[in-house]
């Protein structure tokens, strides 16, 4: 048999197949099913839906369903000794304390074991202080307050804004400018959208919500306890001290409705502009401490929350290939949820679920994918990604020599306007012609394709009539495949009109009213949106797996390594003296470029042309674009940041959720004007721009002819 | 659904004091303050001040300083307003309003008044 | 303390009719967060007040869309585009953007 016909039994098991057999009826069932109750990452009723998938998973009809567990550091309230923040007056009696706990949704209060809102890895503390209110937290944020308003946060409680950045990164933050304490909460500014009611009538915030979540800055490492290997039943575990990215000062979350109590009295400096100020009905004063009448009062803080060494579990589901069964191609999303999930995560679970139950239903009439296929449901991703790291450390052999790529699934749906796609380069023409033959689901394009839907709505900043395709960053299971180890990925959702609000969230998330309801009463009632991620999420896993000639172009990459050369570069040159007193040159890197440039594009043109019924050749083609994202792995990783090995993109040192491109160079030329020693600050910069080169150049030689 | 109910109508002399109370159903009470309003027969409506349940924190009308205490009791989520040394010029409806924080920051809800007569 | 002042004191309408009320304050109403809170009430005959429109625009749940609200600074209005029989009684403007709240005088609208 040829290989084609060893994958396509009969013609009729093509991609078409496989998308038609998809129903946006069964991934509301599953969304459903999934939802009724909390499945908090290390608790008993996680582990039960682990088992409930595995069962699910084999009856669908994958050749086998595997649970994978670890023991990994956790975070939780401690259930007789709750978290909140007081304000105490001269005495120390406490005169306004925060909510204990959400209010519970319509048809929710008499479920058990919903975890109050938390900080998770908070450590215990009860510090009291004068607050500063730090806006969103971010480097900017303190370069403002620190440098222009010559605010010193050291010895103080500051409360900051969620949004923009990623949680983690407000604490280190604040840890480094000597805070003492943390208060997080969600402006309405950034979690309200005009217009729109408040949970249970609309999907907006209510005052009482509360976003929960980690708050490491664990940089990939995975568990805090064992960095770099799995946390099996023999570890080696290190001492909590050693841990990795653990806060060092406590942190609690509160609601808009306590924020104001605590907003309201703050005194001392006003805002310095308007980007300071959010929709609360307070003077957004940045402190230190309270105006007149309350100068006496203070901030008490009370944490006792405990990190314990808990199991988790991840179901990891295979559907072996008939031709090149050690290649893999992984769809994985995580189960963990705070409380409910209704978006995160089970929105995409229900999604990797119903595509499970139609490659499935293929394979049971006769079909195999040409490559493997796996599916994980993963644990613990909101405690730090940790179910998918440690079983990535666990498998890193296999997955560096036969890992193809990574399809992310966490949450289907972030609003319903237009498709968000984040993905390696190598993905861009997979993408773009994937969507081409997909139906939009939106409203006024019946009849049109989901490529125009979305060209139309959010249109690439550079290329007219293409979509806009964002970098990679973290935040998520995709980081330990693509970062660390080097395997393509690339993840896609359904977004809202709100780019100037990237990484807030959607209203509700990570709170207790984020249930089923919100999403079939207010974001997608016929699941027309999760059918179309799934159409696109599934669509993507069809054609890694399947098609002879593995669907990446090289020459993207090209394109975009030039467009990121050009822009460091540019960040370079806003030093044009010291570039010109260290010698610094970015020669090398414009010329590795080039080269690649020239490889990639006759690389492509060797691709058109070579004989794809011989096997050797097209596997030794195959391997070539397999290893391609491979070759921009540097073995020693980043500066302080061993973990993130991808020399062309990292997540951004200030914001965990997006991607930064040359993250070497870019953190050697940061803020580089206040650094004490510029000599060794420039000579940094020229040793980045040397690893970049090289790297680039490296790549480049992979997709030369072999001999 | 949102309830703030008054106590009964009072008659008082002038000199006297009258406490008036205010009890809350439906809605956190901790999270919102209590306004006190009162309308004089046939006039206009005037803020006498508001209090915090959260904190008890109170921030009353100069007018009545001196002469107003606001109070609360978080146990029966109930408000309380005493004005002393009354006149005939305290006659009038006096409401609770609930002071609907974000996204309102308005009087949201309103109860059904208490009518206080000062007369010898 | 911020004045109120409120024109017409009294405005008869037909049933049908578009109705305006206008509410001047004695300073900006422009909070530092770059919020007006002004709003209207109506008291209709033997009834508490009840917030018809917030923050100057923005209709109070349950309000019918034939009430609209608009103005800056310390100019505002409130229309009624169809007048009907239940929006009879006494409507209020109200600003807390200063410390002490206060109210217009009010406007009673009533049948021609």
């Known amino acids: 048999k040829s290989s084609n016909e060893a994958t396509n039994i009969t013609p009729k098991h093509n991609m078409k197949a496989f998308l038609d057999e998809l129903k946006a009826e069964n991934i509301k069932k599953f969304l459903y099913n999934f939802t009724q109750i909390p499945h908090l990452a290390g608790t008993e009723q996680n582990f039960q839906l682990a088992k409930q998938i595995q069962s699910q998973w084999k009856e669908f009809g994958l050749d086998s369903v595997e649970l994978a567990h670890y023991d990994v550091l956790l975070s939780y309230p401690n259930k007789t000794h709750p978290n909140y923040i007081s304000i105490i007056n001269e005495d120390g009696n406490e005169i306004f304390n925060t909510s204990l706990f959400e209010p519970p949704p319509p048809g929710y209060e008499n479920v058990s074991d919903i975890v109050p809102p938390f900080s998770a890895f908070s450590p215990q503390g009860m510090p009291e202080g004068d607050l500063v209110y730090v806006n969103y937290a971010r480097t900017e944020d303190f370069f403002k307050l620190e440098r222009d308003m010559k605010i010193n946060c050291s010895g103080k409680i500051v409360i900051a804004r969620y949004g923009k950045v990623f949680r983690g990164n407000k604490v280190k933050n604040a840890q480094l400018a000597g805070a003492k304490g943390v208060i997080l909460y969600s402006d309405p500014a950034d979690y309200f959208a005009p217009g729109v009611k408040s949970y249970p009538d609309g999907w907006n915030l209510p005052g009482g919500g509360v976003q929960r979540g980690n708050i490491l800055n664990l940089n990939g490492a995975g568990d805090p306890l064992t960095p770099g290997y799995p946390a099996n039943e023999y570890a080696y575990r290190r001492g909590i001290a050693e841990a990795v990215g653990l806060p060092s000062i406590p942190v609690h979350p509160i609601g808009y409705y306590d924020a104001q109590k605590l907003l309201e009295k703050m005194g001392g400096s006003a805002p310095p502009d308007s980007s300071w100020r959010g929709s609360l009905k307070v003077p957004y004063n940045v402190g230190p401490g309270f105006t007149g009448n309350f100068s006496t009062q203070k901030v008490k803080m009370h944490i006792h929350s405990t990190n314990e060494v808990t199991r988790i579990y991840n179901v990891i589901g295979t559907l072996r290939g008939a031709v090149e069964p050690d290649r893999y191609v992984i769809l994985g999303g995580h189960r963990d949820s705070w409380v409910f999930g209704g978006i995160d995560p089970q929105s995409g679970a229900a999604v990797v679920h119903e595509i499970v139950r139609s490659f499935g239903t293929l394979k049971k009439e006769g079909w195999r994918p040409r490559r493997t296929i796996l599916f994980a449901s993963w644990d613990a991703e909101e405690f730090g990604l940790l179910g998918s790291t440690e079983w990535a450390e666990e498998n890193s052999r296999l997955l560096q020599e036969r890992g193809v790529a990574y399809i992310n699934a966490d949450s289907s749906i972030e609003g319903n306007y237009t498709l968000r796609v984040d993905c390696t380069p190598l993905m861009y023409s997979l993408v773009h012609n994937l969507t081409k033959e997909l139906k939009s689901p939106d409203e006024g394009f019946e009849g049109k394709s989901l490529y125009e839907s979305w060209t139309k709505k959010s249109p690439s900043p550079e290329f007219s009539g293409m979509p806009r395709i964002s970098k990679l960053g973290s935040g998520n299971d995709f980081e330990v495949f693509f970062q660390r180890l080097g395997i393509a990925s690339g993840r896609a959702r359904y977004t809202k009109n709100w780019e100037t609000n990237k990484f807030s969230g959607y209203p509700l998330y990570h709170s207790v009213y984020e249930t089923y309801e919100l999403v079939e009463k207010f974001y997608d009632p016929m699941f027309k949106y999760h059918l179309t991620v799934a159409q696109v999420r599934g669509g993507m896993v069809f054609e890694l797996a399947n098609s002879i000639v593995l669907p990446f172009d090289c020459r993207d990459y090209a394109v975009v390594l030039r467009k990121y050369a050009d822009k460091i570069y540019s960040i370079s040159m806003k030093h044009p003296q010291e570039m010109k007193t260290y010698s610094v040159s970015f020669d090398s890197l414009f010329s590795a470029v080039k080269n690649f440039t020239e490889i990639a594009s006759k690389f492509s043109e060797r691709l058109q042309d070579f004989d794809k019924s011989n096997p050797i050749v097209l596997r030794m083609m195959n391997d070539q674009l397999m290893f391609l994202e491979r070759a921009f792995i540097d073995p020693l990783g980043l500066p302080d940041r061993p973990f993130y090995r991808h020399v062309i993109y990292a997540p951004s040192s200030h914001n965990k959720y997006a991607g930064e491109s040359f993250p070497g160079i870019y953190d050697a030329l940061f803020d580089i004007e206040s650094k004490v020693d510029p000599s060794k600050a420039w000579g940094e910069v020229k040793r980045q721009i040397y690893v970049a080169a090289f790297t680039v150049q490296a790549a480049a030689e992979t997709l030369s002819e072999v001999a | 659904q949102v309830q703030l109910v008054q106590s009964g109508a009072e008659v008082k002399k002038p000199g006297a004091s009258v406490k008036l109370s205010c009890k809350a159903s439906?809605?956190?009470?901790?999270?919102?303050?209590i306004n006190w309003v009162r309308q004089a027969p046939e006039q206009g409506l005037e803020w006498m001040g508001g209090?915090?349940?959260?904190?008890?924190?109170?921030n009353y009308n100069e007018n009545f300083k001196g002469r107003v205490t606001m109070t609360i009791d978080t146990s029966s989520s109930t408000a309380y307003i005493e004005l002393s040394r009354l006149t005939s010029d305290d006659t009038a409806v006096y409401y609770c309003?609930?002071?609907?924080?974000?996204?309102?920051?308005?009087?949201?809800?309103w109860g059904q008044g208490t009518t206080v007569t000062v007369s010898s | 303390d911020v004045v109120m002042t409120q024109t017409p004191l009294s405005l008869p309408v037909s049933l049908g009719d578009q109705a305006s009320i206008s509410c001047r304050s004695s300073?900006?109403?422009?909070?530092?967060?770059?919020?007006?809170?002004l709003h209207w009430y109506l008291q209709k005959p033997g009834q508490s007040p009840k917030l018809l429109i917030y923050?100057?625009?923005n209709r109070f749940s349950g309000v019918p869309d034939r009430f609209s609200g608009s103005g800056s600074g310390t100019d505002f209005t409130l229309k009624i585009s169809r007048v009907e029989a239940e929006d009879l009684g006494v409507y209020f403007c109200?600003?807390?953007?200063?410390?002490?709240?206060?109210f217009g005088g009010g406007t009673k609208l009533e049948i021609k």
């Open positions: 309003a609930r002071d609907g924080n974000f996204p309102y920051y308005a009087m949201d809800s």
């Open positions: 439906g809605y956190t009470f901790t999270y919102f303050d």
């Open positions: 209090i915090s349940p959260g904190d008890g924190n109170t």
């Open positions: 300073q900006s109403l422009v909070h530092s967060n770059g919020n007006t809170y």
């Open positions: 923050k100057v625009s």
């Open positions: 109200s600003q807390s953007t200063h410390v002490p709240y206060t």
